[in-house]
């Protein structure tokens, strides 16, 4: 796969994943419960990171936000934080990767700058994806371990029921948002890895340019890696000799410092 294709595909995959992370964060169905089938109506409760909703068998739905921060479990706050961090990193990653795309020309930006930006955006996408996966997994773990289940408080009362408060035993199931979050986090992660792979293709590979230029008085000897003599010239007229088609050159100018084509 060409560098441009790999980079472009990585960007698109990350973009889809990022959109999924936003969708999962905003969704109400993080956990769903078949709450209670009482004589009045069957009640279905689903809850997200920001609000809780109740739907009746008639179709009527009521949603209310978690207005207080103090009363919320610390784990929920942690999940919110992870998802927001994932979104913020994703936004930065997208902005950086747009400028890094090989198919987009911005000024006189060379491949090495684009390579650095591609690597940066790739790392940002990887961290963003990991944040989303961890956030969703923490929430899922809380559901599995019945973290939310409140303990029953019993109060003395008339006939064994007056003034009584009891926990309604409900079956907790993973909501759609969890699956969206896992898939989205995975896609963002994969896209980030692809961007990092594309970065390697954008950087000039050291192994292609390992020609050593020895500036000796009156002679120039350049060697290929592995000790094979590439060219030997005597006299001061041996300039700009091509070693091979890759484009690396030996230069025997009157400079004592290495030129930008000298890779050691």
């Amino acid at each position: 796969m060409s560098v441009t294709a790999c980079q472009g595909l990585g960007f698109v995959v990350s973009l889809i994943g990022f959109a999924g992370i936003i969708a999962a964060t905003c969704m109400d169905q993080w956990s769903t419960q078949d709450l209670y089938n009482n004589p009045v109506t069957a009640v279905f409760n689903y809850q997200g990171l920001w609000r809780s909703c109740v739907r009746e068998s008639s179709g009527f739905t009521e949603c209310r936000g978690y207005f207080t921060l103090l009363g919320l479990p610390a784990m929920l706050q942690a999940v919110r934080a992870l998802m927001i961090v994932g979104i913020v990193l994703g936004v930065i990653g997208i902005l950086v990767s747009i400028f890094a795309l090989k198919c987009i020309r911005i000024g006189s930006m060379d491949d090495s700058a684009k390579a650095k930006m591609t690597l940066t955006s790739g790392i940002l996408f990887i961290i963003s994806g990991i944040c989303a996966i961890i956030g969703v997994s923490v929430f899922a773990n809380m559901l599995v371990t019945n973290f939310w289940m409140s303990t029953a408080n019993m109060y003395s009362g008339m006939g064994g029921m007056g003034g009584m408060v009891q926990t309604v035993q409900t079956r907790y199931t993973f909501g759609a948002a969890l699956f969206v979050g896992w898939v989205a986090g995975g896609l963002t992660l994969i896209g980030g890895v692809m961007m990092c792979i594309a970065c390697r293709g954008l950087t000039p590979d050291d192994s292609n340019f390992k020609a050593v230029s020895y500036h000796a008085s009156g002679q120039n000897v350049a060697y290929r890696p592995g000790g094979f003599k590439a060219s030997t010239g005597f006299g001061s007229n041996t300039r700009n000799k091509k070693i091979y088609d890759g484009g690396a050159r030996t230069e025997d100018d009157e400079q004592s410092h290495p030129t930008k084509y000298d890779y050691v």
Epitope: V54, E62, R64, W148
Partner: nanobody, 120 residues
């Protein structure tokens, strides 16, 4: 913690009317269903009437056409208007509230009860 307080009970003559109120307070996100149950001495508890947030209602067979349930969602309060009362309506009336009090915290809360006596 969620509290439920009933009021409005008392002594009434047959054919008379009473209005019961039940208010829920505390850590409440939703009250999907608010209901009235009653229990006469030596008898089983039975549903009188119930109402959901969306306005769906259900009445016990013995009170249909005589009792009307309503609620004020903003105040988390349910009302039971009892008309054409009969001596057999004499019982302790309990308010039952289904509460979503937080993330995954679902409670069924009962009030202490209010006594309704229908007698001449």
């Amino acid at each position: 913690e969620v509290q439920v307080v009933e009021s409005g009970g008392g002594l009434v003559q047959p054919g008379g009317s009473l209005r019961l109120s039940c208010a829920a307070s505390g850590s409440i996100l939703h009250i999907p269903v608010m209901s009235w149950y009653r229990q006469a001495p030596g008898k089983q508890r039975e549903l009188v009437a119930g109402i959901s947030t969306g306005g769906t209602t259900n009445y016990g067979d013995s009170v249909k056409g005589r009792f009307t349930i309503s609620r004020d969602n903003a105040k988390n309060t349910v009302y039971l208007q009892m008309n054409s009362l009969k001596p057999e309506d004499t019982a302790a009336y309990y308010c039952n509230v289904l509460v979503v009090s937080g993330i995954g915290s679902h409670l069924e809360v009962w009030g202490q009860g209010t006594l309704v006596t229908v007698s001449s």
